[in-house]
Structures are given as structure tokens and as C-alpha cells.
Amino acid sequence: SQVSNLLKQQQTNLTHQKNKLEGQISARQQAEEASQESQNELKEMIETLAWKLNEKSKEQMELHHQNLNLQETLKRVANCSAPCPQDWIWHEENCYLFSTGSFNWEKSQEKCLSLDAKLLKINSTADLDFIQQAISYSSFPFWMGLSRRNPSYPWLWEDGSPLMPHLFRIRGAVSQTYPSGTCAYIQRGAVYAENCILAAFSICQKKANLRAQ
Amino acid sequence: SQVSNLLKQQQTNLTHQKNKLEGQISARQQAEEASQESQNELKEMIETLAWKLNEKSKEQMELHHQNLNLQETLKRVANCSAPCPQDWIWHEENCYLFSTGSFNWEKSQEKCLSLDAKLLKINSTADLDFIQQAISYSSFPFWMGLSRRNPSYPWLWEDGSPLMPHLFRIRGAVSQTYPSGTCAYIQRGAVYAENCILAAFSICQKKANLRAQ
């Protein structure tokens, strides 16, 4: 009975320990579940942050490219090459230069080419009005980029396009044939045909640089 | 003895259960420690990501401001008002306009003022060379911004500054007195004095807009 009592006491102890351990395990299990939950939350947070970081990186890359482009454009524009070079007249889409020397038509054409331009081309009555006004204080003739081989050929501009008949009437040596061809000049607002070999002033024309305007 | 055996058996079971539970607790403890470690790592990772995200946001903000500034500058520069208005000639620091109508000196002065300009002022031989060349194909006179009340007064530019004597010699009506004063015009490269009441072409001049050049 003494043994039995001792065993009973030990059993009670063991049961108590077991219950205690089971309680501990239950608590640990709950804590573990909570920890798992927390860990999942942390992982989710990490995923969100990583995604956000990735998005930010993409946006930043885009902004960086935009920046580079803007800087490039700014460099180009800040040079803001004026619409026309010095000494030229800017009018609408074109730049005009009134030559200060007298040369034959071919030489005048070469002079314009050396300036990355062509001899005057009149495309419209507005162009004609501007030129007439610009040379209103001169009594001299100015070669323009209009010529023809002989009276049986059409009047052509330097770019090969034909003269629009409504623009102006050509006076002077219209019926003449010259070995050097017949060229057109403008004087006091009227257009005349003459031997291309003659020396005259001239008007060069080129497209205005209007990118940055 | 039967009770004793039963108690011993129960005791053995309980001890086994206790040991098992202790093992479980030990395993759980290790797992918990590992989980804690992992959680700490995750937290650290979150901290790092959060810091990185914050940095990126700052950089992005900076880039965004840079972008806005660049766009602002671009807007300002892209207006890049050309050095000179249309129909004017840009030469060095100035813009020049050759009038297309004939007016007396005072009226010519008013015309220039209405264009935010003044009548031609020649400051140097380089200026003179340019003007002489620019009017080389005209035989007409052009008023400039030089005048005097009568022969006992000095020649003055519109801004009140005196004419530098070495620049050019004034020919013509230099000794004449006119009620409207004596004004200077340039023709075929030479400068002449004449009654300001006469009508002539004129040359307007203003500073070129070279900010963005």
C-alpha cells in the first residue's frame, strides 16, 4: 500500500507534468500559428515593397530617359540656331539674301549653292509681293532661279518645277534664243527674260530653320 | 500487486507521453527560434526595402523636378524668339529694317519708334561697311538717326550721343540752316546733310535678341 501510494503520487505528478506540457504545447502551437501568420504578413509586405520598388525603378528609368531627351533637345534648341543666318532676311518659311555683287546667272547660282541655298523661287503672289517690296528701293535687276533653254522650252525653276502661268508675265527677251540660255530677273516688281551671260545682282533663298520657333 | 502493476504500467505510459511531449516542446522551441530568426530576417528585409523605396522616391522626386525645370526652360527657349523679327536683317548685335516707303525724317523716326526701334546709328567702320554693302544695290537716299538744329550745333544721334568725327565726312547742305533742322542720309555709301522735311527711305535699327543664341 505504501508502494501503491507512492506510485499514485508519482502518477499524479506525471499527469500534472503531462497536462502542463500539453498546455505548453498548445500555447506553443498557438504562438507558432501566430508566428506563421505574422511571417506570412511579413512576406506579403516584402512582396508589396519589392513590387513598389520595381515600379519606382521603372518610373525612374522613364523619367531618366525623359530627362536625357529633354537635355538633348535643350542642347539642340539652346543653340537655337536663328531662323536665318546673319545678313539674311527671314520672311515666313524662307530666308533671303540679296547679293552685294554682280554676276552672270550661272555664277549667281553657284554663289547661292555655296551658301546652301538656291536662287529665288516665287511660289505664290504673297512671295511676289514680299520680293517686290523688298527690292522697292532698288532700280537694279536681280536674277531669280528661273530659266529656259530656248523659246520652245518651258520656263523652269532650279528644282525642275515649271512656272505657274498666273503668277507673273515675263517681259523682255522672251522670244530670244541665247547660247547660254534665257534667264529671268526681277526689277522694280516686274519679271524680264534676258541673256543668262549678263552680270546682275541676285537673290538667294533657303528654308528658314523654324524647328524651335 | 495487480494494482501495483497497473499503476506501473500507467506510470510508464505517462513517462513515455511526458518524454514525447518534452521532445515535441524541444522541437517546437527550435522551430520557434528558427521562426524568430526568419522573422527577424524578414523584418530586416522589409526595413531595407522600405529604405530603398524611400530613396527611390526621393530620387524620383528630384528627377521629376529636374524634368519640370527642363520643360520650363525648353518652353522659354523654344519660344527662342529669333534674333530679329521677320523681314528685318540680323547683323552682329543689331536688327535692321529698310523702309519700303518714303517719309520725312520725323515721320521716319516715328515709324521706327512704332516698331520698338530707332533710326540707324553707325557706331563703327564695321557698321558703316555693313550698311554700305546692304544698300549697294540702291541709288536712293536713306535717312539715318543723325541730325542737328543748325550749323552751330553738333551732329547728334537720336540717343543724344555725338558723332565720332573719324567715322565719315558729311557732304551736301552742311552749312545750311532749315526750320525743321538738318538731317543726315546715306546714299551709295556716302553721307549727306539735307533738309529734314524731305521724304526719303529710312533704316530702322534695334538690338538683336541674342539671349538664347
Epitope: N104, S139, F140, P141, R171, G172, A173, S175, Q176, T177, Y178, P179, S180, Y185, Q187, R188, A190, Y192, A193, E194, N195, I197, L198, A199, A200 | -
Partner: antibody
């Protein structure tokens, strides 16, 4: 029909001046270049000057450059030659001639006017 | 200062063919057209040939012109008494920018 009629010739002392005119009719005056050509007694033709349709081109012989001035008035269909500082060697019959091109041929001529420079 | 050179005189019998030469340089005949004029005694000159070989209306086809290099020539076939006159060649000199005439050739129709 085309007509060119010179006038203004006469006797003038050396150093003197004279203005010749050439009245045109029978054609569109402003469509032609006009020349002055002279011929000294018993000599050949000597070109003097030419003016283009609206007066933009004017050319002169070296012998008259600086002394003679060619001009035209298209509203009056008239060509002029202002002759200053005249010399004995300027004595000649002065013809006006029209030209369909400044550098081309003279397809019509006037009958001429005699200028005599003598003291 | 005559720039174009012509023989002072040529002659031929009626019905014959005569030629009058006109010599210049690259700046005139060499690069421009040549014209020929006939001047009968006491009258104004009259255009005979233009653009080297073109005859204005009213000019008989007995008159013809040609050009080669820096020289030109006027040929008259079937010579007639009324052809007796002075003949002048003319061109444009682009270097001196002026009209140049030949000194003239006196054509005498013999017999």
C-alpha cells in the same frame, strides 16, 4: 509699223552738252531693249550705249563712259541720250535701234540725227 | 577700238558668190550669236542675218550666215547690183559688257 525717230542733234561746242531723243511707235516699247549707235562721217558703225526694258541694265562704250547717260521713259515711249563734255570725236550721225534682247540683234533702226561738235 | 575684224572690201561680178568673214574671240563670237547688217549709201543700217544664220522676213535667201568657233561669215550668192553696200557683223562681248561691231566691209558689184 515700227517707227523710231531721233531728234535733238545739232552743232555744239567742245565741252558742251546735248540731249538726244528717240520717239518710238508701232510696238510695245517696254518689251524691247534700246541702243544708241553712231557713225562718224565716212566711218563704220560704233555702238554707244544700251538700256534694258525698264532701265535695269545700262551699258556704255568706253569712249563715252562717264560723259553720256542713257535713259528711257516708258510712259512716253521715248529713249534719251544725255551727252556732256562733248568732244570733236563725238561728231557723228546718232541712230537709235531697238533690240528684242539686250545682247541680241537690232531689228529696227531710226534714220539718225547728226551731232556736230566744233568750235 | 574695233573688236571684230572684217576685210575692208570685197567685190564680185553679178551672179557670183561672195563671202565676208568676221573674226572675233571667245568672249564675243565664241560665246554669243552674230548678226549682220547691210547699209546702203545714205541710209540707216538694216538687219540681214541674226542668231548666226536666221534671216528676218523680207530678206532674200541669197543671203546666208554661218558661224564656226570664234569666226562668222556672210555669204551672198547670185550677186546683184543693189547688193552694193557696206556690211557689218555684230555680236555681244560678255567680258567688256558691250555690243561690238566689225569695221565694215564695202561690197562692190563689178561691171
Amino acid at each position: 509699223q515700227v517707227q523710231l525717230l531721233e531728234s535733238g542733234g545739232g552743232l555744239v561746242q567742245p565741252g558742251g552738252s546735248l540731249r538726244l531723243s528717240c520717239a518710238a511707235s508701232g510696238f510695245t516699247f517696254s518689251d524691247y531693249a534700246l541702243h544708241w549707235v553712231r557713225q562718224a562721217p565716212g566711218k563704220g558703225l560704233e555702238w554707244v550705249s544700251v538700256i534694258s526694258y525698264a532701265g535695269g541694265f545700262k551699258f556704255y562704250a568706253d569712249s563715252v563712259k562717264g560723259r553720256f547717260t542713257i535713259s528711257r521713259d516708258n510712259s512716253k515711249n521715248t529713249l534719251y541720250l544725255q551727252m556732256n563734255s562733248l568732244r570733236a570725236e563725238d561728231t557723228a550721225v546718232y541712230y537709235c535701234a531697238r533690240s528684242p534682247g539686250l545682247t541680241s540683234y537690232h531689228d529696227s533702226w531710226g534714220q539718225g540725227t547728226l551731232v556736230t561738235v566744233s568750235s | 577700238d574695233i573688236v571684230l575684224t572684217q576685210p575692208p572690201s570685197v567685190s564680185g561680178a553679178p551672179g557670183q558668190r561672195v563671202t565676208i568673214s568676221c573674226s572675233g574671240s571667245s568672249s564675243n563670237i565664241g560665246s554669243n550669236y552674230v548678226s549682220w547688217y547691210q547699209q546702203l549709201p545714205g541710209t540707216a543700217p538694216k538687219l540681214l542675218i541674226h542668231s548666226n544664220s536666221h534671216r528676218p522676213s523680207g530678206v532674200p535667201d541669197r543671203f546666208s550666215g554661218s558661224k564656226s568657233g570664234t569666226s562668222a561669215s556672210l555669204a551672198i550668192t547670185g550677186l546683184q547690183a543693189e547688193d552694193e553696200a557696206d556690211y557689218y557683223c555684230q555680236s555681244w562681248d560678255y567680258e567688256s559688257e558691250r555690243v561690238v561691231f566689225g569695221g565694215g566691209t564695202k561690197l562692190t558689184v563689178l561691171g
